[in-house]
């Protein structure tokens, strides 16, 4: 699987999850999030050669098409597969609120 | 929606579904598919600016991050959202077989 366990331990050029730390205030301008200050959102990148963690039949077909037609602009793209939530603390006026934001952390990638 | 109805009728630079005809024999080397000769598989391409058909909270966050940090390599990617099957005819020996291949035709795209 193209997950953090594999990708963070290997120098992988092809589609893999990459570490990306996002600071809410500095990187997004989100002053309203009080905790955490930031988090590892991670991201997916790298080429998707034929059959690499193909998401659907279409991505398999497109991967093969791209292999046999290397000049073509059509090719699968490396995108998130498994995502995890992040719990944040913010204030509505003087009232603290805790919310679980879904799909905030990329744990693995796929070629789609 | 970034679907064929919209994308095929507009000159859209950003993420959209694009027409792509694939000939099974010529483009894939699949001689075993007898019918159809080929089909419109289509594909997704184009930049994913902030909030454009964002698939998850992560893609929204990543889009904003990319907007505020344009030098960053991390950005959402335009990939298939809705796919449709394709029915094909092939032979096993002298016996004709009809099979519906799932997720073969891209009908719409999203930023993931």
């Amino acid at each position: 699987a193209l997950d953090t366990n594999y990708c963070f331990r290997n120098l992988e050029e092809n589609c893999c999850v990459r570490p990306l730390y996002i600071d809410f205030r500095q990187d997004l301008g989100w002053k309203w999030v009080h905790e955490p200050k930031g988090y590892y959102a991670n991201f997916c990148s790298g080429p998707c050669p034929y059959l690499r963690s193909a998401d659907t039949t279409h991505s398999t077909v497109l991967g093969l098409y791209n292999t046999l037609n290397p000049e073509a602009s059509a090719s699968p793209c490396c995108v998130p597969q498994d995502l995890e939530p992040l719990t944040i603390l913010y204030y509505v006026g003087r009232t603290p609120k805790v919310e679980q934001l879904s799909n905030m952390v990329v744990k693995s990638c796929k070629c789609s | 929606a970034l679907d064929t109805n919209y994308c095929f009728r507009n000159l859209e630079e950003n993420c959209c579904v694009r027409p792509l005809y694939i000939d099974f024999r010529q483009d894939l080397g699949w001689k075993w598919v007898h019918e159809p000769k080929g089909y419109y598989a289509n594909f997704c391409s184009g930049p994913c600016p902030y909030l454009r058909s964002a698939d998850t909270t992560h893609s929204t966050v990543l889009g904003l991050y990319n907007t505020l940090n344009p030098e960053a390599s991390a950005s959402p990617c335009c990939v298939p959202q809705d796919l449709e099957p394709l029915t094909i005819l092939y032979y096993v020996g002298r016996t004709p077989k009809v099979e519906q291949l799932s997720n073969m035709v891209v009908k719409s795209c999203k930023c993931s």
């Epitope: 002053k31 603390l89 006026g93 003087r94 603290p96 | -």
Partner: antibody
């Protein structure tokens, strides 16, 4: 650098009025709630009045000890928060601090202004 | 309103001593994994200064000899090795609900 400069304190007779001002600089004033915290001589800290940002409709809070006598307000265009104090009593004698609380804690404090209520 | 009780109300210690101050809330001031308790230092004639926010986070410019811990109703401020400039009064404050309240203070004096 965040700065909070209080003014308007002084000696006033019981039943009198005073208006405290706090001029803020060095941060996005419009985004944050502002508070007045007082400290009577030799005593602890008491939050007396609080006003949140426009985002939350300038909602105010007052401690029971000053309710109906004190009014907190803010002028975002001047980055200033005010405390109008009426019907002052001897027990209102204290140093009044202007503070900013971006998220639960009072991160920055002014130097304080002394209010003395005495005849 | 949530009441905060600090103990001791005063203590005498020497330079180099490890000092622990506790703050007990009348009800929990934690929400999920977030602990909404904060600590301040005040020296005579000066305004209070934020030391620790959300139970364990060191405020900007505060020396690492200060630390905070706790959750729910019981919280602790620790000075690992007391310095001459640390003799002051320390206050806890919660932000679990409105109104936010302060503890009565703990005065740290020179023995």
């Amino acid at each position: 650098e965040v700065q909070l400069l209080e003014s308007g304190g002084g000696l006033v007779q019981p039943g009198g009025s005073l208006r405290l001002s706090c001029a803020a600089s060095g941060f996005d004033f419009n985004s944050y709630g502002m508070s007045w915290v007082r400290q009577a001589p030799g005593k602890g800290l008491e939050l007396v009045a609080d006003i949140v940002s426009k985002t939350y409709n300038y909602t105010t809070y007052y401690s029971d000890s000053v309710k109906d006598r004190f009014t907190i307000s803010r002028d975002d265009s001047k980055s200033t928060v005010y405390l109008q104090m009426n019907s002052l009593r001897a027990e209102d004698t204290a140093v009044y601090y202007c503070t900013v609380a971006p998220g639960g804690s009072f991160d920055y404090w002014g130097q304080g202004t002394l209010v003395t209520v005495s005849s | 309103d949530i009441q905060l009780t600090q103990s001791p109300s005063s203590l005498s210690a020497s330079v180099g001593d490890r000092v622990t101050i506790t703050c007990r809330a009348s009800q929990s001031v934690s929400i999920s994994r977030f602990n909404l308790m904060h600590w301040y230092q005040q020296k005579p004639g000066k305004q209070p200064k934020l030391l620790i926010y959300r139970a364990s986070n060191l405020a900007s410019g505060i020396p690492s000899r200060f630390s905070g811990s706790g959750s729910g109703t019981d919280f602790t401020l620790t000075i690992s090795s007391l310095q001459p400039e640390d003799f002051a009064t320390y206050y806890c404050q919660h932000s679990r609900e409105s109104p936010w309240t302060f503890g009565g203070g703990t005065k740290v004096e020179i023995k």
